[in-house]
């Protein structure tokens, strides 16, 4: 495997991770795929300090993060444990609201204008943040 020792061009380094902040919107799955094709993942917030860093960079704009409950329980895209981990939901959230009229509930989490989290319809075209860790060996699958 290969190790990433510095952040790619246009990415921001912070606490041994690299972050990329979009300035346009995509549905959650499309944003997730963009990050994955860049060997990254939608941002996983593990501390109040990281929350404040991301919030500073995105401003008061709805922005996807790597947290969803599309398969039942809430899960972080990198496997970080949700139950024991950092959370910053708005009061009364997540609520899996069905009243939006778009079909289904709300299965994807985003930063709201004040930085706190809300669950929303995954198809909404919000901005997003990619994250990749430095010094993490990237596992190349064996060739067939």
């Amino acid at each position: 495997g290969s190790e990433r020792t510095c952040c790619p061009v246009n990415w921001v380094e912070h606490e041994r991770s690299c972050y990329w902040f979009s300035r346009s919107g995509k549905a959650w799955a499309d944003a997730d795929n963009y990050c994955r094709l860049e060997d990254a993942h939608l941002v996983v917030v593990t501390s109040w300090e990281e929350q404040k860093f991301v919030q500073h960079h995105i401003g008061p704009v709805n922005t996807w993060m790597g947290l969803h409950d599309q398969n039942g329980p809430w899960k972080w895209v990198d496997g970080t444990d949700y139950e024991t981990g950092f959370k910053n939901w708005r009061p009364e959230q997540p609520d899996d609201w069905y009243g939006h009229g778009l079909g289904g509930g709300e299965d994807c989490a985003h930063f709201t204008d004040d930085g706190r989290w809300n669950d929303d319809v995954c198809q909404r075209p919000y901005r997003w943040v990619c994250e990749t860790e430095l010094d993490k060996a990237s596992q190349e699958p064996p060739l067939l």
Epitope: S24, L37, P125, S138
Partner: antibody
Framework: EVQLLESGGDLIQPGGSLRLSCAAS????????MSWVRQAPGKGLEWVSA????????FYADSVKGRFTISRDNSKNTLYLQMNSLRAEDTAVYYC??????????????WGQGTLVTVSS | DIQMTQSPSSVSASVGDRVTITCRAS??????IAWYQQKPGKAPKLLIY???SLQSGVPSRFSGSGSGTDFTLTISSLQPEDFATYYC?????????FGPGTKVDVK
């Protein structure tokens, strides 16, 4: 100068297997997402598959999912496409293409010259 | 999947003409679109990305515009080397999809 050179195209019977290769040079291969795009004779372009720079994330068109496997060897600057259970409709020129990420999306900024795969009995 | 349609399917033009090709997406794709030029027996070449950004080395007579579902490629003054087939491609979401192409040939 970026160069992509495909090889491995051949005449193959339906149900057979083939592996295409793409030798890359002129850029940092291990940092670049790569893709395969095909073009049936006299037809338009069809995206087939893509892979991240490390090889850890792969994506496929529904038409090839479960039959084709994209992979790469960054030590050899080479991209591969393993094609199994080939069908007549897989007959096409297969292009290797480099992907560039620009402000939130990916585009094919360099292409190889293509290699012809013909599936026929 | 997002379907891309192009019009016209072919256009006959002369050197110096202004040529406009349109592309429509089956759903909104913001500005996540590219335009490629392909000549017979050759690989495609990237001309425009992000709907309106000119790829390095591409002549300024090529321009792109549009957002959402409707996009345009314009060649302001057709040159002999511009006779080719032009494809639009969306990269908003997987699977990436191309339009069927527009052939620009000699009138």
């Amino acid at each position: 100068e970026v160069q992509l050179l495909e090889s491995g195209g051949d005449l193959i019977q339906p149900g057979g297997s083939l592996r295409l290769s793409c030798a890359a040079s002129g850029f940092t291969f291990s940092s670049s997402a790569m893709s395969w795009v095909r073009q049936a004779p006299g037809k338009g372009l069809e995206w087939v598959s893509a892979i991240s720079g490390s090889g850890g994330n792969t994506f496929y068109a529904d038409s090839v999912k479960g039959r084709f496997t994209i992979s790469r060897d960054n030590s050899k600057n080479t991209l591969y496409l393993q094609m199994n259970s080939l069908r007549a409709e897989d007959t096409a020129v297969y292009y290797c293409a480099k992907l560039i990420a620009v402000v939130g999306s990916h585009y094919f900024d360099y292409w190889g010259q293509g290699t012809l795969v013909t599936v026929s009995s | 999947d997002i379907q891309m349609t192009q019009s016209p399917s072919s256009v006959s033009a002369s050197v110096g003409d202004r040529v406009t090709i349109t592309c429509r997406a089956s759903q909104g794709i913001s500005s996540w679109i590219a335009w490629y030029q392909q000549k017979p027996g050759k690989a495609p070449k990237l001309l425009i990305y992000g709907a309106s950004s000119l790829q390095s080395g591409v002549p300024s007579r090529f321009s792109g515009s549009g957002s959402g579902t409707d996009f345009t490629l314009t060649i302001s003054s057709l040159q002999p080397e511009d006779f080719a087939t032009y494809y639009c491609q969306q990269s908003n979401s997987f699977p990436f999809t191309f339009g069927p192409g527009t052939k620009v040939d000699v009138k």
